[in-house]
Interface confidence: medium
């Protein structure tokens, strides 16, 4: 829980089509995809990998096949489960070293239309590295989309995109904690449009949840909750047809 | 109703040690860091540190980690700062104060107790 | 350690008039286009009530006659109109990084 978190200064923008290696080392960044426009990215995120991160592991890949804009993705039952037995998911924040969520993954739901509202089990809670990945199509004339990142009955965190709150869009995050909603973190940039598909990714680091849509860097949410291993259940809901749900480390 | 209830004003002689009690009621007591604050009259507020009770970890205020040990009971939902060595300096009134958890661990502190009086003297 | 110079040290104030307490901080409180400032009052014999947040944020239950601006280095607290139940003493206090610090109070008083 230090207190030097890196938050959203560093935005893309800068013209790097994968800045510190989000979200592109894993996405389909299309060209000129960034962001915030004008904004900077001075070298942020301190102590992640430079560009074209992750050296030695394979960039998970490109969803080749889904519906629409999602070339590719993996036909229904591709997904393998989740490991099983003892010490599959080890209880601490961070990953064991043999590599407690291994990155072969993904886990999840096969592709194909799912029940909204949808519970991907997150067995062993998050850890940083992890990798949730949610593909769909906002239904026309929409007015919510809310994912709940569960703990019991506290959210961790809800990322809750709001298509007309006093004729505005905006995009509500926050924490609920003993029943109570915490104070809002507001995000007035918003890349959701009804009746077109969407992606999004959110990645757990060690101080905060990271997420992009449609492979563009959004906004960062700091862990209001400290034990990342009692989070195990992701809450999707709102005006959406889901297509996937998955999750995998990288 | 979230409530942090602290102990009765204390009378220490120089040299000796002092602990204060605070006890946190109405919100789950480990969702949330436990601040303690010194004020002196006229001297304004300082900050002595923090402590998560969730799994005891602690951040001080430099100027306070020789004078001051920070430390919980989850089983009463009660922290509590020692306060070391006490000298005319340490006269003042303690504060506990919940850290609300809003961006991370920089959140205001929200809810604080009626402050406890500690006066050094012979 | 960051140092917080609130001023002025005390201020007088007719009702229904306007307060303004400034904090200036010796850097920069900004994180992420987020200020790291925080505002209390404080009556005698009390412990300190939250008032602003985050620089600007009114906490819940607070008057909205009470607000909060300014950015990086610079912010400032105002009161309008001046009500009697605002006569008290006012600190700002930053949360940007450990050790937090006080600003050395402003003592509001009705004129």
């Known amino acids: 829980m230090a207190d030097n978190f890196s938050l959203h200064d560093a935005l893309s923008g800068s013209g790097n089509p994968n800045p510190q290696g989000w979200p592109g080392a894993w996405g389909n960044q299309p060209a000129g995809a960034g962001g915030y426009p004008g904004a900077s990215y001075p070298g942020a995120y301190p102590g992640q990998a430079p560009p074209g991160a992750y050296p030695g592991q394979a960039p998970p890949g490109a969803y080749p096949g889904a519906p629409g804009a999602y070339p590719g993705a993996p036909a229904p039952g591709v997904y393998p489960g989740p490991p099983s037995g003892p010490g599959a998911y080890p209880s601490s924040g961070q990953p064991s070293a043999t590599g407690a969520y291994p990155a072969t993954g993904p886990y999840g739901a096969p592709a194909g239309p799912l029940i909204v509202p949808y519970n991907l089990p997150l067995p062993g809670g998050v850890v940083p590295r992890m990798l949730i990945t949610i593909l769909g199509t906002v239904k026309p004339n929409a007015n919510r989309i809310a994912l709940d990142f569960q703990r019991g009955n506290d959210v961790a965190f809800h990322f809750n995109p709001r298509f007309n709150e006093n004729n505005r869009r905006v995009i509500v995050c926050n924490t609920k904690l003993d029943n109570n909603w915490g104070r809002e973190e507001r995000q007035s940039v918003f890349p959701f449009e009804s009746g077109k598909p969407f992606k999004i990714q959110v990645l757990v680091e060690p101080d905060h949840f990271k997420v992009a849509v449609n492979d563009a860097h959004l906004l960062q949410y700091n862990h209001r909750v400290k034990k990342l291993n009692e989070i195990s259940k992701l809450g999707i809901s709102g005006d959406i047809d889901l297509t996937s749900a998955s999750y995998t480390m990288i | 109703e979230v409530q942090l209830q602290q102990s009765g004003a204390e009378v220490v002689k120089p040299g000796a040690p002092v602990k204060l009690s605070c006890k946190a009621s109405?919100?789950?007591?480990?969702?949330?860091?436990l601040n303690w604050v010194k004020q002196r009259p006229g001297r304004g507020l300082e900050w002595i540190g923090r402590?998560?009770?969730?799994?005891?970890?602690?951040h001080y205020n430099q100027k306070f980690k020789d004078k001051a040990t920070l430390t919980v009971d989850m089983s009463s939902s009660t922290a509590y700062i020692q306060l070391s060595s006490l000298t005319s300096e340490d006269s003042a009134v303690y504060y506990c104060?919940?850290?609300?958890?809003?961006?991370?661990?920089?959140?205001?502190?929200?809810?604080w107790g009626q402050g406890t009086s500690v006066t050094v003297s012979s | 350690d960051i140092v917080l110079t609130q001023s002025p040290a005390s201020l007088a104030v007719s009702l229904g008039q306007r307060a303004t307490i400034s904090c200036r901080a010796s850097e920069s409180l900004d994180n992420s286009g987020i200020s790291f400032m925080n505002w209390f009052q404080q009556r005698p014999g009390q412990p300190p009530k939250l008032l602003i947040y985050a620089a600007s944020n009114l906490e819940s239950g607070v008057p909205a006659r009470f607000s909060g601006s300014g950015s990086g280095t610079d912010f400032s607290l105002n009161i309008h109109p001046m009500e009697e139940d605002d006569a008290a003493m006012y600190f700002c206090q930053h949360s940007k990084e450990v050790p937090w610090t006080f600003g050395g109070g402003t003592k509001l008083e009705i004129k």
């Open positions: 109405g919100y789950t007591f480990n969702n949330y860091w």
């Open positions: 402590i998560d009770p969730s799994d005891s970890e602690t």
């Open positions: 104060a919940r850290g609300d958890y809003y961006y991370g661990t920089r959140g205001p502190m929200d809810y």
